[in-house]
């Protein structure tokens, strides 16, 4: 904490200008008011303060706005905002998407994943929901950052928004949050021909139930193998060798690459290996001819 | 051949929280989506929601503060936990399975349980 | 929320004639309704899909037709086992929504 000082009467301040990069930390703290520094916020980031400037600067804010900053100043942090912690951004309330926009901008390039992740968080909350206009800023500005939601959070985004979602976006999404993804797209997407729905649902297909994997098996649509390797473990298990061979198509032959990777290697597993030696790639450790297949599972539902 | 079947008190008292359970057999429950709909007596029906077996749901926003549906992969079952009923809550609660085929395209139900009468009275 | 409004509530038709029921949707639904069957004490049973899609196993008298806000269901010559409530549902969004019910009685 900065020690409490009086300030000198010629330091005194009545506006925030290029002269306070000469106050020592000590004299910012004692001269800068913080109702003045909020309400000149939007000056503060033309200004080239040192980092521990703006900790004083910060520190100024905080105690002003003890329960989270208003929008009024948030809008104008600038490089300011790097000084912020998830914990102070959890405190506020954004609304704007051009205050969305200007924090993007500013966190590029620094090692803010954190901090935007619950920035955009606090900005869904804001908003009531992941509209469209929220999902558009966040692809433009930040690419990869709709991942960074949580599951709960993308479920506000109306079905209606899917298709304004890229491929790229959801590279760095995992299962919990294709799970929520995936049924909206399969809305969103229903109307559409095969191929043209294909290759719409394709980067949904990570959160795709068995069914609708084995149904997209008899649609011609020769899935390739990074597709297929990001399908979950439980709705490739079930499927036929069959089932798959139709599914790739083409990129059949991919399997053999991946043999030892999940999920390929549990499907092979589960397979019988004359059915694996149908597909002529040499696929190992399938089940031995004339082994019986009990499926506990299913019996234990029954029971 | 997959079955469903709702279990669960068939009394609860006002303000209190409806608690049911469907089983479904004969099949897993990571293959499709789960939903549960209802039926007041002499009415129509009403979508509650849906869940998937990783524990991911869509609810009816009508009734979305008060619902909450959950899974157990391990017993084959989903649940469905409605808080804070009133009389306007009687009705036959149903599970049922969405179609899950993308060569159809829809959320619609082909398979449904055989019902539940849940009345909600003092 | 979409909602589904049939006609009539109630329809009184003769074993072996035509029975048409209508389903009108507040706003476009394209081609996402499904209708149903249910029998006194029985769950649903689902009919159609896709507005115009027998599912497996229903009889070819049973018909749809319509895309956008209004649907058919048709039944070309009623059996004894056709007098029930028919209901459609929308899927065209979030929430899925049901129509009230038409009750088909013998005449």
């Known amino acids: 904490d900065v020690e409490r000082t009086t300030c000198p009467p010629e330091k005194e301040v009545h506006e925030i200008d290029e002269s306070l990069i000469f106050y020592k930390k000590r004299e910012l703290e004692a001269c800068v008011d913080a109702a003045l520094l909020a309400a000149q916020m939007d000056r503060v980031d033309a200004i080239p303060f040192t980092y521990e400037q703006l900790d004083v600067l910060k520190h100024k804010l905080d105690e002003l706005y003890p329960q989270g900053y208003p929008e009024s100043v948030i809008r104008h942090l600038g490089h300011l905002f790097l000084k912020m912690s998830p914990e102070d951004i959890r405190k506020w309330n954004v609304t704007s998407l051009e205050t969305l926009k200007a924090l993007l901008k500013v966190s590029k390039g620094h090692e803010m994943s954190a901090q935007v992740a619950t920035l955009i968080d606090r900005v869904v909350v804001g908003r009531g929901q992941l509209d469209k206009d929220t999902v558009d800023t966040l692809t433009a500005f930040c690419p990869g950052c709709l991942c960074s939601l949580s599951p709960e959070r993308l479920s506000s985004v109306p079905p209606s928004v899917i298709g304004a979602v890229r491929p790229q976006d959801l590279d760095t999404c995992g299962p919990r949050q294709l799970d929520v993804l995936y049924p909206k797209a399969r809305l969103a997407f229903q109307n559409m021909s095969g191929s043209e729905y294909f290759v719409k649902i394709r980067p949904f297909l990570g959160g795709a139930p068995t069914e609708d994997v084995k149904a997209l098996s008899q649609q011609n649509v020769s899935m390739d193998l990074a597709t297929f390797m990001k399908l979950r473990r439980e709705a490739v298990l079930p499927l036929t060798v069959a089932e798959v061979q139709k599914l790739l198509g083409p990129h059949v032959e991919g399997l053999k690459v991946e043999e030892q990777h999940s999920p390929v290697r549990d499907w092979i597993l589960k397979q019988r290996q004359d059915d694996l030696d149908t597909l002529g790639l040499g696929l190992q450790g399938g089940i031995p001819n004339g082994y019986l297949i009990l499926d506990l599972s299913v019996r234990e539902a029954l029971s | 051949q997959v079955q469903l079947q709702e279990s669960g008190p068939g009394l609860v008292k006002p303000s209190e929280t409806l608690s049911l359970t469907c089983t479904v057999s004969?099949?897993?429950?990571?293959?499709?989506?789960w939903s549960w709909v209802r039926q007041p007596p002499g009415k129509g029906l009403e979508w509650i929601g849906y869940?998937?077996?990783?524990?991911?749901?869509q609810s009816n926003p009508s009734l979305k503060s008060r619902v909450i549906i959950s899974v157990d992969t391990s017993k084959n079952q989903f649940s469905l936990k409605l808080s804070s009923v009133t009389a306007a809550d009687t009705a036959v609660y149903y599970c049922?399975?969405?179609?899950?085929?993308?060569?159809?395209?829809?959320?619609?139900?082909?398979?449904w349980g055989r019902g539940t009468l849940v009345t909600v009275s003092s | 929320e979409i909602v589904m409004t049939q006609s009539p509530a109630t329809l009184s038709v003769s074993p072996g004639e035509r029975a048409t029921l209508s389903c009108r949707a507040s706003q476009s639904v394209q081609s996402n309704l499904a209708w149903y069957q249910q029998k006194p004490g029985q769950a649903p049973r689902l009919l159609i899909y896709?507005?115009?899609t027998r599912a497996t196993g229903i009889p070819a008298r049973f018909s749809g037709s319509g895309s956008g806000t209004e649907f058919t269901l048709t039944i070309s010559s009623l059996q004894s086992e056709d007098f029930a409530v028919y209901y459609c549902q929308q899927y065209n969004n979030w929430p899925l929504t049901f129509g009230q019910g038409t009750r088909l009685e013998i005449k």
């Open positions: 869940i998937f077996y990783s524990g991911s749901t």
């Open positions: 004969g099949g897993s429950i990571q293959n499709y989506y």
């Open positions: 049922a399975r969405e179609v899950g085929r993308i060569a159809v395209a829809g959320w619609f139900f082909d398979l």
């Open positions: 896709g507005a115009s």
